[in-house]
């Protein structure tokens, strides 16, 4: 990862929320589901209702970068998703409220979105060569690549 | 398929300790929470609590908490339930549930054991 | 804690009639409310989810609707094996709280 000290004097301002209630399927097809409270983790759905519906909500930096910067939140609920240190499953951390200023140790709410065709990434903004992932027989983790699955299909407006 | 099968009938005295299995197959035991939920005879469903099958934490309902206690083996899939200091109003059939959530924000019991009689009589 | 309230306790209809059960919570659930039918000496059995959404295998006359607090469980068309205690449950937030139960018979 790089070192935090890089990133603490960044300062990132939520702009609005810019996707509302999408599924993210794995390579696998797996969709991410909510697994004991606090977690996540991948699984082949025959419903696609057990399926995480996320929000996603757009921040800008102070340091102009050209990066769409994100953070997910699980729809209808204040719960977000936070990423711990590489291989550590991320977590759900619920607040009373999306955040309006995140800098410092509170990056680890927000993602770098990259796209490339109809693969999506997400960077953890705190360790920024690690990806939100989804690992077999594991949570939904930061990794920096195989075995673990890193690229994401964004499904929209499921019913 | 999923399956929650539990362990047999109890008759207990009162002031005794009574501890009920949940065995579960069919699916990984550890991505579900298992709740516990009991009902009196001719009475309604009372939700007693839940166990995280991965972290091994409990959250209890207010009216059961210091008197129950839900313990886990992840290597047989087995879910427990233990209750002391029975009394007759603890005459109940006891259910263990798994959890889903549906959306990752709204939860339901989808899977169900078959329920364990325990009666306390003296 | 979110407490349920569930009316009527019992109601007797014949085969064939539309019967509607209601659920009140005691502060807005955000459609996160489901509803289990639990036949004589059987174990319950989740009939619906989030408010609307039928459970694999649940028959299309049983329904769902409602939002807030505020939510209606219906059976459009009774039939005989429909004899059960039906039970509302908010699955917004801990504790998980069930409805006291209506208890269906027929006429």
């Known amino acids: 990862s790089a070192p935090f000290s890089f990133l603490s004097n960044v300062k990132y301002n939520f702009m609005r929320i810019i996707k509302y209630e999408f599924i993210l399927n794995d390579a696998l097809n797996q969709s991410i589901i909510r697994a004991n409270d606090q977690y996540l983790t991948a699984a082949a759905l025959h419903n696609l209702d057990e399926a995480v519906k996320f929000d996603m909500g757009a921040y800008k930096s102070s340091k102009d970068d050209a990066k769409i910067t994100v953070i997910l939140r699980i729809s209808k609920t204040q719960l977000y998703v936070t990423a711990q240190d590489e291989d550590q499953p991320v977590l759900l951390k619920e607040m009373p409220e999306i955040p309006k200023t995140i800098t410092g140790s509170e990056t680890n709410l927000l993602f770098f979105w990259e796209t490339h065709g109809t693969k999506n990434y997400f960077t953890s903004v705190a360790h920024p060569n690690l990806f939100i992932a989804t690992k077999q027989d594991y949570w939904v983790c930061l990794a920096g690549g195989p075995p673990s699955i890193t690229d994401f299909q964004i499904l929209e407006n499921q019913a | 398929e999923v399956q929650l099968v539990q362990s047999g009938a109890e008759v207990k005295k009162p002031g005794v300790s009574v501890k009920v299995s949940c065995k579960a197959s069919?699916?990984?035991?550890?991505?579900?929470?298992m709740h516990w939920v009991r009902q009196a005879p001719g009475q309604g469903l009372e939700w007693m609590g839940w166990i995280n099958t991965y972290t091994g934490e409990s959250t209890y309902a207010d009216d059961f908490q210091g008197r129950v206690t839900f313990t886990l083996d992840t290597s047989t899939s087995t879910a427990y339930m233990e209750l002391s200091s029975l009394r007759s109003e603890d005459t109940a059939v006891y259910f263990c549930?798994?959890?889903?959530?549906?959306?990752?924000?709204?939860?339901?019991?989808?899977?169900w054991g078959q329920g364990t009689t325990v009666t306390v009589s003296s | 804690d979110i407490q349920m309230t569930q009316s009527p306790s019992s109601l007797s209809a014949s085969v064939g009639d539309r019967v509607t059960i209601t659920c009140r919570a005691s502060q807005d659930i955000s459609n996160c409310l489901n509803w289990y039918q639990q036949k004589p000496g059987k174990t319950p059995k989740l009939l619906i989810y989030?408010?609307?959404r039928l459970h694999s295998g649940v028959p299309s006359r049983f329904s769902g609707s409602g939002s807030g607090t505020d939510y209606t469980f219906t059976i459009s068309s009774l039939q005989p094996e429909d004899i059960a205690t039906y039970f509302c449950?908010?699955?917004?937030?801990?504790?998980?709280?069930f409805g006291q139960g209506t208890k269906l018979e027929i006429k």
């Open positions: 449950q908010q699955g917004k937030t801990l504790p998980y709280a």
């Open positions: 549930a798994r959890g889903i959530y549906y959306y990752g924000s709204s939860y339901a019991m989808n899977y």
């Open positions: 989030y408010t609307s």
């Open positions: 069919g699916y990984t035991f550890t991505t579900y929470g």
